[in-house]
């Protein structure tokens, strides 16, 4: 079945941009001017997920790369990773649960809750140049709010 997708960038609520840090990690840092071109472009897709009033299930791929954000247990802790997929088969409507995030959109702010691990969110640190990670607290030191910007082709 066809999947609705869009291309976008994400910045955390402190306006830090997301960039690649090695082949399988994202980090968050402040960018300006031409450096903004370093930021990752996501292909966000509307996928099948569990029902909830203000949660919309999405998958977050890296545009024109066969990489998707996924949530897995590592050393018994929910962990965010970039996972390689077969580009012939992705994106698809029925994504495996580890790839699914519940997008919560309130007042132009977005949160991305792991469908696999409820109450765990895509997060950034207050500090500069730190990895993007899966965090189990909301409203604490770590940042779970993002803004989205469409990317013009």
């Amino acid at each position: 079945a066809p999947v609705r997708s869009l291309n976008c960038t994400l910045r955390d609520s402190q306006q830090k941009s997301l960039v690649m840090s090695g082949p399988y990690e994202l980090k968050a840092l402040h960018l300006q001017g031409q450096d903004m071109e370093q930021q990752v472009v996501f292909s966000m897709s509307f996928v099948q997920g569990e029902e909830s009033n203000d949660k919309i299930p999405v998958a977050l791929g890296l545009k024109e790369k066969n990489l998707y954000l996924s949530c897995v247990l590592k050393d018994d802790k929910p962990t965010l990773q970039l996972e390689s997929v077969d580009p012939k088969n992705y994106p698809k409507k029925k994504m495996e649960k580890r790839f699914v995030f519940n997008k919560i959109e309130i007042n132009n702010k977005l949160e991305f809750e792991s469908a696999q691990f409820p109450n765990w969110y895509i997060s950034t640190s207050q500090a500069e140049n730190m990895p993007v990670f899966l965090g189990g607290t909301k409203g604490g030191q770590d940042i779970t709010d993002f803004t989205m910007q469409f990317v013009s082709s």
């Epitope: 079945a1 066809p2 609705r4 997708s5 869009l6 291309n7 976008c8 966000m44 509307f46 029902e51 909830s52 009033n53 203000d54 919309i56 999405v58 409507k93 997008k103 959109e105 132009n108 803004t147 989205m148 910007q149 469409f150 990317v151 013009s152 082709s153």
Partner: antibody, heavy 119, light 108 residues
């Protein structure tokens, strides 16, 4: 004030073209999904299509090929280009903002602009 | 494409009545359904989304229920301002978004 204003409607001959505009105020189109919905006189609502980023547009099956949605973020405006118009395209055309990305429902609507296709 | 069918097409009722409008999808759409109210010469207004969630500012006399392929919109006690045309809409699932044909609620 948050609002949408459509313009560009009018009388056009069959086979002709028309471009409708929808200008947003009070919010930025740089992160808002925008749809076009039409309503023929005395008839129901009919979804035309939706635009996310400029490369991500989706259309009703009947609109593909004849209708094109585009956006100019610098002007905070979305467009509906309509080609090869037919009498059955006569309708009020509304633009509407998606409530949340991929929600598929529309919480903010313009006042509509009437397109009449007739010779 | 998924087809949305509303019933009845026209409904006559009086102020204070409890009224129910039904919407049927040609296949399961889970709870991806919204309801709109439209008055003559005006744009539609979102009432309910995700089958049962009241949109901001909508009076609590409106309620929605259902999932799969059968949905209902209920107005618990009709007010004069409620006489209008109501539309259901399939909001998710695939690429196409589809509206029902509408139900005109008129004064008896």
């Amino acid at each position: 004030e948050v609002q949408l204003v459509e313009s560009g409607g009018g009388l056009v001959q069959p086979g002709g073209s028309l471009r409708l505009s929808c200008t947003a105020s009070g919010f930025s189109l740089s992160s808002a999904a925008m749809a076009w919905v039409r309503q023929a006189p005395g008839k129901g609502l009919e979804w035309v299509g939706i635009i996310y980023d400029s490369a991500s547009t989706y259309y009703a099956s009947w609109a593909k090929g004849r209708f094109t949605i585009s956006r100019d973020t610098s002007k905070n405006t979305v467009y509906l280009q309509m080609n090869s118009l037919r009498a059955e395209d006569t309708a009020v055309y509304y633009c509407a903002r998606e409530r949340a990305i991929f929600s598929g429902d529309f919480v903010l609507w313009g006042q509509g602009t009437l397109v009449t296709v007739s010779s | 494409d998924i087809v949305m069918t509303q019933s009845p097409s026209t409904l006559s009722a009086s102020v204070g009545d409890r009224v129910t409008i039904t919407c049927q999808a040609s296949q399961s759409i889970s709870s991806y359904l919204s309801w709109y109210q439209q008055k003559p010469g005006k744009a539609p207004k979102l009432l309910i989304y995700r089958a049962s969630t009241l949109a901001s500012g909508v009076p609590s006399r409106f309620s929605g229920s259902g999932s799969g392929a059968e949905f209902t919109l209920t107005i618990s006690s009709l007010q004069p301002d409620d006489f209008a045309t109501y539309y259901c809409q399939n909001t998710g699932g695939g690429i196409n978004i589809a509206f029902g044909q509408g139900t005109k609620l008129e004064i008896k």
